[in-house]
């Protein structure tokens, strides 16, 4: 599986901020089915796209947490968004609709970085960061920031601080973080590759 | 399909700049990365660098940096390099390549343009 | 910047023999490696990715194969139309880089 964890972080995180505002307000009312919790207001209003895709799927699963996110953003007029994350889904069970042939599994979504295709997946698992901090350091990742995810106590959460810094990054920088892993922990891409 | 089609060949003098066009069709140029290599004469390929269209960034080979320019229109979903100060050593077949794959690990080139030969002579 | 090593520069065999072409990387490039053919005045076309992928409609006599800084391309039982130069190109690190080439020409 996570496959629909990763189309539903996708989703999110290709939201504004004030769509994913929206989002969030909307999941407080969304009906649920029966047997479902609704997660608790003040968690929710806190979390980035990432912490809600762990909440969504802890809560209701991966595939009903997909259908969830898809209901949401088509209650939100955002149509095209929920077909895409229902389609990624079908694809990862197997399943395509009647007369539509699924895609590859290496039809990624196009235009979207390697890292930003895999970001929940490297966030835990990448465990040489303090190796793609100094790979970094100077041409991507500025003092500050070096020291900032440095002072984050665990992998996840330095791999967690790394990432808030990439929507700045242009296709490049995003590269040479992608070398620095290939380099440092090639079989964790070779895995994701065929993820 | 996937067509990537450059502009015809350049004869140039030494030191003047060209600048040479690779057109692409049948996917969207935004969401991939373009590729430039030469070839000189009886010499192997060489890797001279890439731009992204979709934000603009490009990656170098130092070897080349401030010879090439690399410059991407996504009116006209063309790529584009210059080609600076001009020497006999600039001579060559220089190729537009599409990777198999933009958001996979590496970068295979499975889409070529046909070339264009560049010849810097007095 | 990562050295590609191809050997041999040139090589001659016979029809329906099975050739062998080695590359080796100065350092250790994993399996992030693929092999090009290139015919006279034609294209450079992409054969293998990641070592041992055959690329889309090349036939299943091209193999190949190696990991982190020894690799081969092998072709069995050797067609006419598969003269022309071999180049193997890391993708590893940046600057990508190619192999020297190997130009295979029929006995």
């Known amino acids: 599986m996570g496959r629909a964890r990763d189309a539903i972080l996708d989703a999110l995180e290709n939201l504004t901020a004030e769509e994913l505002k929206k989002f969030k307000l909307k999941l407080l009312s969304v009906p649920l089915r029966e047997g479902y919790g609704r997660i608790p207001r003040g968690a929710l209003l806190s979390m980035d796209a990432l912490d809600l895709t762990d909440k969504l799927v802890s809560f209701y699963l991966e595939t009903y947490g997909a259908e969830l996110t898809a209901n949401v953003l088509r209650d939100m007029g955002l149509q095209e968004m929920a077909g895409q994350l229902q389609a990624a889904t079908h694809q990862g069970s197997g399943a395509a609709p009647a007369g539509i042939q699924a895609p590859p599994q290496s039809a990624a979504k196009p235009g979207l970085h390697f890292i930003d295709q895999h970001r929940a997946a490297l966030i835990a698992r990448v465990t040489n960061v303090e190796w793609l901090l100094d790979a970094l350091y100077g041409k991507v990742l500025t003092d500050e920031q070096y020291q900032a995810v440095r002072a984050e106590p665990t992998n996840p959460s330095k791999m967690r601080k790394l990432f808030s810094f990439t929507p700045a990054w242009n296709w490049t920088c995003k590269d040479l973080l992608l070398q620095a892993l290939r380099e440092s922990q090639s079989y964790l891409v070779e895995d994701l590759e065929r993820s | 399909q996937v067509q990537l089609q450059q502009s015809d060949a350049e004869l140039v003098k030494p030191g003047a700049s060209v600048k040479i066009s690779c057109k692409i069709s049948g996917y969207t140029f935004t969401d991939q990365t373009i590729h430039w290599m030469n070839q000189r004469p009886e010499q192997g390929l060489e890797w001279i660098g890439y731009i992204y269209p979709g934000d603009g960034s490009a990656m170098y080979n130092e070897k080349f940096r401030g010879k090439a320019t690399l410059t991407a229109d996504k009116s006209s979903s063309t790529a584009y390099m210059q080609l600076n100060s001009l020497t006999s050593e600039d001579s060559a077949v220089y190729f537009c390549a599409r990777p198999l794959y933009s958001y996979a690990s590496y970068y295979w080139f499975a889409y070529w343009g046909q070339g264009t030969l560049v010849t810097v002579s007095a | 910047d990562i050295q590609m090593n191809q050997s041999p520069s040139s090589l001659s065999a016979s029809l329906g023999d099975t050739i062998t072409i080695t590359c080796h990387a100065s350092?250790?490039?994993?399996?992030?490696l693929s092999w090009y053919q290139r015919k006279p005045g034609n294209i450079p076309k992409l054969l293998i990715y990641?070592?041992?992928n055959l690329h889309t409609g090349v036939p299943s006599r091209f193999s190949g194969s190696g990991s982190g800084t020894g690799f081969t391309l092998t072709i069995s039982s050797l067609q006419p139309e598969d003269i022309a130069t071999y180049y193997c190109q890391q993708g590893q690190s940046y600057p990508l880089t190619f192999g020297g080439g190997t130009k295979l020409e029929i006995k």
């Open positions: 350092q250790n490039i994993n399996v992030w």
């Open positions: 990641k070592s041992s």
